[in-house]
């Protein structure tokens, strides 16, 4: 950056090189060039010469003043016009930054995705700071008082093998940057209470012709958790409102859920599960599309595939969709 140049003088910023966005700031330039009494001192921001708000303080020093500075980053340098010198002489340069102190981190959430071997902790960092902001995640055992700290710039994955202080912990997040430091409330967790079962996936659908046609949705999960509660939501693609069905599920076999749907309509399905009685849900599964037949029986399956409708009696395809849903982050 500009801070690496060889200087023939000094440039400094008041109140500081990193300051709160919207502040009034002063940039000072002091020349120390051999055999040069500067005729004029010039300031450049991002390579463009500044023309206003420059005050000469004395023979070697000038000040550039900015009101309500709003740029997150700028490269400043200053030059001198020396007698008998054809070009301006570089004095020095500095990178400056403006931003905000961190907000108090809130909505601290820690979950263990089954089979991941990690505890994943996330939080709401608040408003954008524009400057380098680091987060320290504190994990303190309620049983041994031992505390681990993890430095990160966003979320954190903590190996469950490193959590050797029992099952109960406090977790909190400290946010810090050049303009301030804040700390979240403490979240109390029990490792057994924050496990999210292995993802539930809708594999196929079929509509069976009967007196009243019914659609069967086939879905499964690789979870080893015994007591699992699930929700399946569905709607016509033209609708805004979801219908939700609840299930207490045992995943020793593929689940089959029955729906009585309107004919000749394209529906979308999603499923999510949680360990029964626990706090956190899986994110909703990928969108799974199924179009009910007009009257003829059809076997169909579609998760974000292109339409493959035949004029024949049956249309069959395997669910391959892995596009994330509109509610991917909904774990609470």
């Amino acid at each position: 950056g500009i801070t690496n140049i060889n200087c023939s003088g000094h440039i400094w910023v008041e109140p500081a090189t990193i300051f709160k966005m919207g502040m009034n700031i002063s940039i000072y330039c002091q020349a120390a060039i051999k055999n040069c009494q500067p005729r004029k001192l010039h300031f450049y921001k991002n390579g463009i010469k500044e023309r206003f708000q420059i005050t000469r303080i004395n023979k070697t020093t000038a000040r550039l003043w900015y009101k309500n500075f709003l740029e997150p980053h700028a490269s400043m340098y200053c030059t001198a016009e020396c007698p008998k010198h054809f070009q301006e002489t570089l004095i020095c340069g500095k990178d400056i930054s403006s931003g905000y102190p961190p907000d108090i981190p809130d909505e601290v959430t820690c979950v263990i995705y089954e089979y991941s071997g990690n505890m994943t902790c996330t939080w709401n960092a608040g408003k954008l700071t524009y400057i380098d902001t680091k987060y320290v995640v504190h994990v303190k055992s309620l049983e041994t008082e031992e505390e681990q700290q993890y430095l990160t710039s966003s979320y954190i994955n903590i190996s469950t093998d490193s959590l050797q202080g029992g099952k109960k912990y406090l977790v909190w997040v400290q946010a810090a940057n050049a303009l301030g430091m804040e700390e979240s409330k403490q979240l109390q967790i029990h490792l057994d209470d924050i496990v999210i079962p292995s993802a539930a996936v809708i594999s196929r659908a079929e509509t069976i012709n009967a007196t009243v046609p019914k659609t069967i949705i086939y879905w499964d999960s690789q979870t080893t958790i015994e007591k699992v509660s699930c929700e399946m939501r569905y709607k016509a693609t033209t609708n805004q409102t979801w219908n939700v069905k609840e299930f207490d599920t045992n995943f020793t076999y593929v689940q089959q859920s029955e729906f009585y749907l309107e004919p000749n309509i394209k529906y979308v399905f999603q499923v999510r599960c949680q360990e029964t009685g626990k706090r956190y849900w899986q994110p909703w599964s990928s969108l799974f599309f199924h179009k009910t037949p007009e009257t003829v029986p059809q076997v169909t399956s579609k998760a974000f595939q292109h339409d493959t409708w035949n004029s024949g009696l049956t249309v069959a395809s395997i669910s391959t969709g892995h596009l994330t849903s509109d509610n991917r982050g909904d774990i609470g």
């Epitope: 320290v136 504190h138 303190k140 309620l142 041994t144 008082e145 031992e146 505390e147 681990q148 700290q149 993890y150 430095l151 406090l170 909190w172 400290q174 430091m181 804040e182 700390e183 403490q186």
Partner: antibody
């Protein structure tokens, strides 16, 4: 068994700075630990000054009153922690202790012998 | 800012007496509380940690109880060597930017 050995007594002028050292033996420097500093003015109670956390990264924490005046550092190569207090005034006359449990808990099983710092003009 | 309020500030008792000292935190500190004994000219000595766990080498006449905000140190039968000043200390977290002191103000136990 952790042992903490502090530097000797100091007499300082108001406005100057003092740096007290605390050499630790018996701490596993590969593990996470807190090293903290506590002071006690003559006839007064214990006053927490701050701590340094040493682990995969280093973090320092200071009492509200100590911010800007106290700097705590650790030199892992010599197993020594330091506490520097600047802008000394007469009310900083106290015995200064380093304290730790040799791990990442905040209660203190082990204390240094104390360093008397006298601030006088 | 978590504040630690210790009471009484001093008490007089006789050998064999049961002595109780209380410490109150201004917010929930779970069981993260320690008790220390200090004698004149000496560094403090850890008696109790995690509110109720006895530190190594501490006689069983010392006990601690409480969680959340209210804590108690009890000496079941005061011995001559127990005349000293006792301090509580919150050991929950020191990362909070607004902490002033983590110790209580102290309780001086003197001979009646």
């Amino acid at each position: 068994q952790v042992q903490l050995v502090q530097s000797g007594a100091e007499v300082k002028k108001p406005g100057s700075s003092v740096k007290v050292s605390c050499k630790a033996s018996g701490i596993d420097f590969n593990s996470n630990y807190y090293m903290c500093w506590v002071r006690q003015a003559p006839g007064q109670g214990l006053e927490w000054m701050g701590c340094i956390y040493v682990g995969s990264h280093v973090n320092t924490y200071y009492a509200n009153w100590a911010k800007g005046r106290v700097t705590i550092t650790a030199d892992e190569s010599t197993s020594t922690a330091y506490m520097e207090l600047s802008s000394l005034r007469s009310e900083d006359t106290a015995v200064y202790y380093c304290a730790t449990s040799g791990s990442s808990v905040l209660y203190f099983k082990f204390w240094g012998q104390g360093t008397l710092v006298t601030v006088s003009s | 800012d978590i504040q630690m309020t210790q009471s009484p500030s001093s008490l007089s008792a006789s050998v064999g007496d049961r002595v109780t000292i209380t410490c109150q935190a201004s917010e929930n500190i779970y069981s993260f509380l320690a008790w220390y004994q200090q004698k004149p000219g000496k560094a403090p000595k850890l008696l109790i940690y995690s509110a109720s766990k006895l530190a190594a080498g501490v006689p069983s006449r010392f006990s601690g109880s409480g969680s959340g905000t209210d804590f108690t140190l009890t000496i079941s039968s005061l011995q001559p060597e127990d005349f000293a000043t006792y301090y509580c200390q919150q050991t929950n977290r020191y990362s909070n930017p607004d902490i002033y002191n983590v110790f209580g103000t102290g309780t001086k136990v003197t001979v009646l």
